[in-house]
Protein backbone atom coordinates (compact mmCIF):
# COMPACT_ATOMS: atom_id res chain seq x y z
CA UNK A 1 0.00 0.00 0.00
CA UNK A 2 1.93 2.92 -1.44
CA UNK A 3 1.55 6.10 0.69
CA UNK A 4 0.93 9.16 -1.17
CA UNK A 5 2.88 12.21 -0.09
CA UNK A 6 0.78 15.56 -0.58
CA UNK A 7 2.37 18.27 -2.47
CA UNK A 8 3.89 21.01 -0.91
CA UNK A 9 2.80 24.57 -0.48
CA UNK A 10 4.94 27.77 -1.11
CA UNK A 11 4.29 31.45 0.05
CA UNK A 12 6.33 34.38 0.28
CA UNK A 13 6.23 36.89 3.13
CA UNK A 14 5.68 39.79 2.72
CA UNK A 15 4.48 39.16 -0.73
CA UNK A 16 5.20 38.71 -4.50
CA UNK A 17 6.00 41.90 -5.14
CA UNK A 18 9.15 43.53 -3.59
CA UNK A 19 11.14 46.56 -4.24
CA UNK A 20 14.53 46.44 -5.30
CA UNK A 21 17.13 46.09 -2.01
CA UNK A 22 14.14 44.39 0.04
CA UNK A 23 13.90 41.08 1.66
CA UNK A 24 11.78 38.34 0.79
CA UNK A 25 11.08 35.16 2.15
CA UNK A 26 9.99 32.30 0.70
CA UNK A 27 8.17 29.61 2.87
CA UNK A 28 7.59 25.98 1.67
CA UNK A 29 4.95 23.50 4.10
CA UNK A 30 4.75 20.10 4.06
CA UNK A 31 3.72 17.58 5.96
CA UNK A 32 4.92 16.49 9.42
CA UNK A 33 8.36 14.37 9.21
CA UNK A 34 9.76 16.08 6.60
CA UNK A 35 13.77 15.96 6.24
CA UNK A 36 14.66 18.59 3.33
CA UNK A 37 12.82 21.20 1.99
CA UNK A 38 14.20 22.14 -1.74
CA UNK A 39 13.30 25.44 -3.34
CA UNK A 40 13.85 25.52 -6.90
CA UNK A 41 14.29 28.31 -9.31
CA UNK A 42 12.58 28.38 -12.79
CA UNK A 43 14.09 25.03 -12.85
CA UNK A 44 15.21 22.22 -11.21
CA UNK A 45 18.71 23.03 -12.46
CA UNK A 46 18.97 26.01 -9.68
CA UNK A 47 18.00 25.05 -6.18
CA UNK A 48 19.12 25.63 -2.76
CA UNK A 49 18.37 22.90 0.22
CA UNK A 50 17.54 23.20 3.76
CA UNK A 51 17.49 20.64 6.84
CA UNK A 52 15.86 23.42 9.45
CA UNK A 53 12.68 22.15 8.98
CA UNK A 54 10.37 23.34 12.07
CA UNK A 55 6.93 21.91 12.91
CA UNK A 56 4.58 24.59 12.14
CA UNK A 57 1.41 22.34 13.36
CA UNK A 58 0.78 19.09 14.68
CA UNK A 59 0.32 18.26 11.16
CA UNK A 60 2.81 20.71 9.24
CA UNK A 61 6.44 21.14 9.00
CA UNK A 62 8.05 24.41 6.80
CA UNK A 63 10.98 25.89 6.11
CA UNK A 64 11.95 29.47 5.24
CA UNK A 65 14.45 30.14 2.62
CA UNK A 66 15.14 34.20 2.99
CA UNK A 67 16.90 36.70 0.16
CA UNK A 68 17.90 39.46 2.04
CA UNK A 69 18.47 42.46 -0.20
CA UNK A 70 16.64 41.58 -3.86
CA UNK A 71 17.97 42.33 -7.01
CA UNK A 72 16.83 42.10 -10.25
CA UNK A 73 17.72 39.00 -11.13
CA UNK A 74 15.68 37.21 -8.00
CA UNK A 75 12.87 37.79 -10.09
CA UNK A 76 11.16 34.42 -11.81
CA UNK A 77 9.27 31.80 -10.40
CA UNK A 78 9.91 29.25 -7.49
CA UNK A 79 8.89 26.39 -6.36
CA UNK A 80 9.05 23.40 -3.41
CA UNK A 81 9.69 19.93 -2.97
CA UNK A 82 10.87 17.86 0.13
CA UNK A 83 12.38 14.70 0.66
CA UNK A 84 10.43 12.41 3.43
CA UNK A 85 12.75 9.46 3.40
CA UNK A 86 12.75 7.54 1.00
CA UNK A 87 10.96 9.79 -1.20
CA UNK A 88 10.51 12.96 -2.72
CA UNK A 89 7.42 14.55 -2.93
CA UNK A 90 5.84 16.28 -6.05
CA UNK A 91 6.35 19.87 -6.71
CA UNK A 92 4.14 22.99 -5.31
CA UNK A 93 2.42 25.33 -8.17
CA UNK A 94 4.72 27.82 -8.89
CA UNK A 95 5.17 31.26 -7.50
CA UNK A 96 6.00 34.26 -9.29
CA UNK A 97 8.23 36.61 -7.83
CA UNK A 98 8.09 40.04 -8.88
CA UNK A 99 10.79 42.69 -8.14
CA UNK A 100 10.01 46.53 -9.13
CA UNK A 101 11.92 49.55 -8.39
CA UNK A 102 11.35 51.23 -5.59
CA UNK A 103 8.82 53.98 -6.28
CA UNK A 104 7.52 55.18 -3.17
CA UNK A 105 4.27 56.31 -4.34
CA UNK A 106 1.34 56.32 -2.05
CA UNK A 107 -0.71 54.32 -4.21
CA UNK A 108 1.06 51.70 -4.70
CA UNK A 109 1.94 49.13 -1.70
CA UNK A 110 5.27 48.06 -1.80
CA UNK A 111 4.43 44.30 -1.66
CA UNK A 112 1.73 42.22 -2.67
CA UNK A 113 0.46 38.63 -0.64
CA UNK A 114 1.69 35.81 -2.18
CA UNK A 115 1.24 32.08 -1.84
CA UNK A 116 0.74 28.85 -3.93
CA UNK A 117 -2.94 29.74 -4.28
CA UNK A 118 -2.71 33.14 -5.57
CA UNK A 119 -2.86 34.66 -9.35
CA UNK A 120 1.13 33.94 -10.11
CA UNK A 121 0.70 30.80 -9.86
CA UNK A 122 1.17 28.18 -12.67
CA UNK A 123 0.19 24.49 -12.74
CA UNK A 124 3.81 22.71 -11.43
CA UNK A 125 4.63 20.15 -14.87
CA UNK A 126 3.86 16.74 -14.02
CA UNK A 127 7.75 15.76 -15.91
CA UNK A 128 9.08 15.18 -12.50
CA UNK A 129 10.59 11.84 -11.16
CA UNK A 130 9.94 11.58 -7.43
CA UNK A 131 13.91 9.60 -7.30
CA UNK A 132 15.27 12.56 -9.45
CA UNK A 133 13.59 16.03 -8.76
CA UNK A 134 17.01 17.88 -9.76
CA UNK A 135 18.87 17.10 -12.66
CA UNK A 136 20.80 14.21 -13.09
CA UNK A 137 24.64 15.48 -12.01
CA UNK A 138 24.03 18.85 -11.80
CA UNK A 139 25.65 20.99 -9.29
CA UNK A 140 23.49 22.70 -6.74
CA UNK A 141 23.75 26.70 -7.83
CA UNK A 142 22.71 28.48 -4.66
CA UNK A 143 19.92 31.03 -5.60
CA UNK A 144 21.42 33.77 -3.84
CA UNK B 1 24.33 0.82 -7.94
CA UNK B 2 25.78 0.82 -4.29
CA UNK B 3 29.27 -0.81 -3.72
CA UNK B 4 31.90 -0.16 -0.43
CA UNK B 5 35.50 -0.60 -0.91
CA UNK B 6 38.54 0.08 1.00
CA UNK B 7 38.21 -3.06 3.51
CA UNK B 8 41.22 -4.14 5.03
CA UNK B 9 43.40 -5.55 7.97
CA UNK B 10 44.38 -2.26 10.23
CA UNK B 11 46.35 -2.94 13.41
CA UNK B 12 44.92 -1.53 16.66
CA UNK B 13 44.96 2.32 17.20
CA UNK B 14 44.99 3.07 13.21
CA UNK B 15 42.76 5.00 10.59
CA UNK B 16 41.04 3.85 7.72
CA UNK B 17 39.21 5.42 4.70
CA UNK B 18 36.02 3.65 3.03
CA UNK B 19 34.64 4.64 -0.07
CA UNK B 20 30.76 4.40 -1.30
CA UNK B 21 30.54 4.68 -5.01
CA UNK B 22 27.32 4.89 -6.64
CA UNK B 23 25.58 4.91 -9.78
CA UNK B 24 22.54 5.78 -11.38
CA UNK B 25 21.53 7.95 -8.71
CA UNK B 26 22.75 11.62 -7.71
CA UNK B 27 23.86 12.02 -4.15
CA UNK B 28 22.26 15.64 -3.85
CA UNK B 29 18.98 13.47 -4.05
CA UNK B 30 19.57 11.18 -1.59
CA UNK B 31 20.67 10.05 2.31
CA UNK B 32 23.90 7.55 2.20
CA UNK B 33 23.54 5.66 5.26
CA UNK B 34 26.49 4.09 6.82
CA UNK B 35 26.18 0.90 8.21
CA UNK B 36 28.01 -2.15 9.93
CA UNK B 37 27.79 -5.34 11.41
CA UNK B 38 30.11 -7.44 13.36
CA UNK B 39 30.89 -11.40 12.82
CA UNK B 40 27.95 -13.21 13.73
CA UNK B 41 26.07 -9.44 15.28
CA UNK B 42 23.23 -7.57 14.48
CA UNK B 43 22.86 -4.25 12.54
CA UNK B 44 24.56 -0.94 14.05
CA UNK B 45 23.89 2.50 12.63
CA UNK B 46 27.26 4.91 12.33
CA UNK B 47 25.49 7.72 10.63
CA UNK B 48 24.56 9.32 7.21
CA UNK B 49 25.06 12.19 4.91
CA UNK B 50 21.98 13.71 3.54
CA UNK B 51 21.13 15.70 -0.04
CA UNK B 52 22.58 18.90 1.66
CA UNK B 53 25.60 17.36 2.79
CA UNK B 54 24.93 17.35 6.41
CA UNK B 55 25.99 14.46 8.62
CA UNK B 56 24.18 12.87 11.59
CA UNK B 57 26.12 10.33 13.53
CA UNK B 58 25.45 7.63 16.11
CA UNK B 59 26.38 9.03 19.38
CA UNK B 60 28.83 6.26 19.92
CA UNK B 61 30.67 7.53 16.51
CA UNK B 62 30.72 11.38 16.81
CA UNK B 63 33.99 12.47 17.12
CA UNK B 64 35.91 9.20 15.47
CA UNK B 65 34.21 8.73 12.64
CA UNK B 66 33.35 11.36 9.75
CA UNK B 67 30.93 11.12 6.50
CA UNK B 68 31.83 13.21 3.70
CA UNK B 69 30.92 13.32 -0.39
CA UNK B 70 34.28 13.17 -1.47
CA UNK B 71 32.86 13.89 -5.14
CA UNK B 72 29.63 13.86 -7.34
CA UNK B 73 29.62 9.69 -7.44
CA UNK B 74 31.52 8.74 -4.05
CA UNK B 75 31.02 8.89 -0.01
CA UNK B 76 33.68 8.55 2.66
CA UNK B 77 33.44 7.14 6.01
CA UNK B 78 36.50 8.11 7.79
CA UNK B 79 37.42 6.14 10.90
CA UNK B 80 40.05 6.74 13.38
CA UNK B 81 41.74 5.17 16.59
CA UNK B 82 40.37 2.17 15.87
CA UNK B 83 40.12 -0.99 18.17
CA UNK B 84 38.97 -4.62 17.64
CA UNK B 85 35.23 -3.87 18.49
CA UNK B 86 35.48 -1.86 15.41
CA UNK B 87 36.32 -5.44 13.38
CA UNK B 88 32.92 -5.74 11.04
CA UNK B 89 31.54 -5.56 7.53
CA UNK B 90 30.88 -1.93 6.50
CA UNK B 91 27.58 -1.35 4.58
CA UNK B 92 26.43 2.00 2.68
CA UNK B 93 23.15 2.18 1.27
CA UNK B 94 20.77 4.43 -0.54
CA UNK B 95 18.63 5.37 2.54
CA UNK B 96 17.35 1.99 3.07
CA UNK B 97 16.33 0.88 0.22
CA UNK B 98 19.90 -0.22 -2.02
CA UNK B 99 22.48 -1.24 -0.32
CA UNK B 100 26.28 -2.41 -1.17
CA UNK B 101 27.67 -6.27 -0.72
CA UNK B 102 30.18 -4.65 2.20
CA UNK B 103 33.36 -4.04 3.12
CA UNK B 104 35.34 -6.34 5.76
CA UNK B 105 37.22 -3.99 8.24
CA UNK B 106 39.52 -6.04 10.50
CA UNK B 107 41.69 -4.54 13.36
CA UNK B 108 44.17 -6.88 14.79
CA UNK B 109 47.90 -6.55 15.45
CA UNK C 1 19.80 6.44 24.69
CA UNK C 2 17.61 4.96 21.88
CA UNK C 3 17.24 1.46 22.39
CA UNK C 4 15.09 -0.72 20.06
CA UNK C 5 14.36 -4.16 21.29
CA UNK C 6 13.12 -7.05 19.89
CA UNK C 7 11.98 -9.35 22.57
CA UNK C 8 12.10 -12.71 20.46
CA UNK C 9 15.51 -13.83 19.30
CA UNK C 10 13.73 -16.78 17.49
CA UNK C 11 10.25 -17.38 16.77
CA UNK C 12 9.76 -20.62 14.58
CA UNK C 13 6.54 -21.53 12.29
CA UNK C 14 5.18 -24.25 9.74
CA UNK C 15 4.99 -23.45 6.10
CA UNK C 16 1.96 -22.10 5.78
CA UNK C 17 1.92 -20.38 9.03
CA UNK C 18 2.41 -16.70 10.40
CA UNK C 19 4.81 -15.31 12.38
CA UNK C 20 4.63 -12.10 14.28
CA UNK C 21 7.80 -10.03 15.34
CA UNK C 22 7.76 -7.62 17.62
CA UNK C 23 9.95 -4.18 18.05
CA UNK C 24 9.62 -1.75 20.89
CA UNK C 25 11.32 1.76 21.16
CA UNK C 26 12.79 2.99 24.38
CA UNK C 27 11.38 6.76 22.74
CA UNK C 28 8.76 7.60 20.50
CA UNK C 29 9.57 7.09 16.61
CA UNK C 30 9.56 10.54 14.57
CA UNK C 31 6.27 10.64 12.35
CA UNK C 32 6.25 6.53 12.04
CA UNK C 33 9.83 5.87 10.47
CA UNK C 34 9.81 2.41 11.58
CA UNK C 35 11.39 -0.07 8.96
CA UNK C 36 11.94 -3.70 8.98
CA UNK C 37 14.60 -5.51 7.13
CA UNK C 38 15.49 -9.07 6.14
CA UNK C 39 18.37 -10.40 5.99
CA UNK C 40 20.46 -13.83 5.15
CA UNK C 41 23.68 -14.87 5.69
CA UNK C 42 26.50 -13.27 3.66
CA UNK C 43 23.71 -10.47 2.60
CA UNK C 44 22.92 -7.65 2.99
CA UNK C 45 19.72 -6.32 4.76
CA UNK C 46 16.96 -5.80 2.58
CA UNK C 47 14.26 -3.64 3.42
CA UNK C 48 10.75 -4.63 3.24
CA UNK C 49 8.54 -1.95 5.33
CA UNK C 50 8.78 1.82 5.64
CA UNK C 51 6.91 4.45 7.42
CA UNK C 52 5.90 1.58 9.32
CA UNK C 53 3.57 -0.17 7.47
CA UNK C 54 4.12 0.92 3.65
CA UNK C 55 5.57 -2.21 1.83
CA UNK C 56 8.67 -1.81 -0.86
CA UNK C 57 8.23 -2.32 -4.14
CA UNK C 58 8.16 -6.15 -5.09
CA UNK C 59 7.80 -7.54 -1.53
CA UNK C 60 5.05 -9.20 -1.11
CA UNK C 61 1.38 -8.59 0.62
CA UNK C 62 2.43 -11.55 2.96
CA UNK C 63 4.61 -8.80 4.87
CA UNK C 64 2.67 -6.45 7.03
CA UNK C 65 4.00 -3.36 9.14
CA UNK C 66 1.96 -2.46 12.27
CA UNK C 67 2.02 0.07 15.24
CA UNK C 68 2.18 3.38 16.47
CA UNK C 69 4.54 5.65 18.78
CA UNK C 70 7.28 2.66 20.89
CA UNK C 71 5.62 -0.54 19.90
CA UNK C 72 5.38 -1.81 16.14
CA UNK C 73 5.02 -5.37 14.54
CA UNK C 74 6.14 -7.16 11.50
CA UNK C 75 3.45 -10.34 10.26
CA UNK C 76 4.91 -13.05 8.01
CA UNK C 77 1.57 -14.60 6.98
CA UNK C 78 1.56 -17.72 4.59
CA UNK C 79 5.12 -18.39 5.46
CA UNK C 80 7.63 -20.04 3.08
CA UNK C 81 11.02 -21.41 3.27
CA UNK C 82 12.70 -18.91 1.61
CA UNK C 83 11.14 -16.63 4.66
CA UNK C 84 13.67 -18.06 6.88
CA UNK C 85 15.91 -15.42 7.43
CA UNK C 86 16.93 -12.28 10.64
CA UNK C 87 14.49 -9.85 10.71
CA UNK C 88 15.61 -6.51 12.10
CA UNK C 89 13.67 -3.36 13.02
CA UNK C 90 14.83 0.46 12.59
CA UNK C 91 13.64 3.17 14.30
CA UNK C 92 14.54 6.75 12.77
CA UNK C 93 14.04 9.80 15.38
CA UNK C 94 13.77 13.38 16.19
CA UNK C 95 16.77 15.08 15.28
CA UNK C 96 17.39 12.67 12.14
CA UNK C 97 19.49 9.41 14.09
CA UNK C 98 18.65 6.00 13.74
CA UNK C 99 18.43 2.54 15.76
CA UNK C 100 18.36 -1.46 14.97
CA UNK C 101 16.47 -3.68 16.72
CA UNK C 102 18.83 -6.79 18.05
CA UNK C 103 16.97 -9.03 15.28
CA UNK C 104 15.05 -11.76 15.25
CA UNK C 105 15.48 -15.09 13.66
CA UNK C 106 13.04 -16.70 12.23
CA UNK C 107 13.20 -20.82 11.34
CA UNK C 108 10.55 -22.09 9.13
CA UNK C 109 9.33 -25.98 10.24
Known amino acids: QEEDLPRPSISAEPGTVIPLGSHVTFVCRGPVGVQTFRLERDSRSTYNDTEDVSQASPSESEARFRIDSVREGNAGLYRCIYYKPPKWSEQSDYLELLVKESSGGPDSPDTEPGSSAGPTQRPSDNSHNEHAPASQGLKAEHLY | SVKESGGRLVTPGGSLTLTCTVS????????IQWVRQAPGKGLEWIGF??????GYYASWAKGRFTISKASSTTVELKMTSLTASDTATYFCARHWDLWGPGTLVTISS | ELVLTQTASSVSAAVGGTVTISCQSS???????LSWFQQKPGQPPKELVY???TLQSGVPSRFSGSGSGTQFTLTISDLECDDAATYYCLGGYSGWFYAFGGGTEVVVK
Open chain 2, 24 to 31: GFSLSNYN
Open chain 3, 51 to 53: WTS
Open chain 2, 49 to 54: ISPAGN
Open chain 3, 27 to 33: QSVYSNY
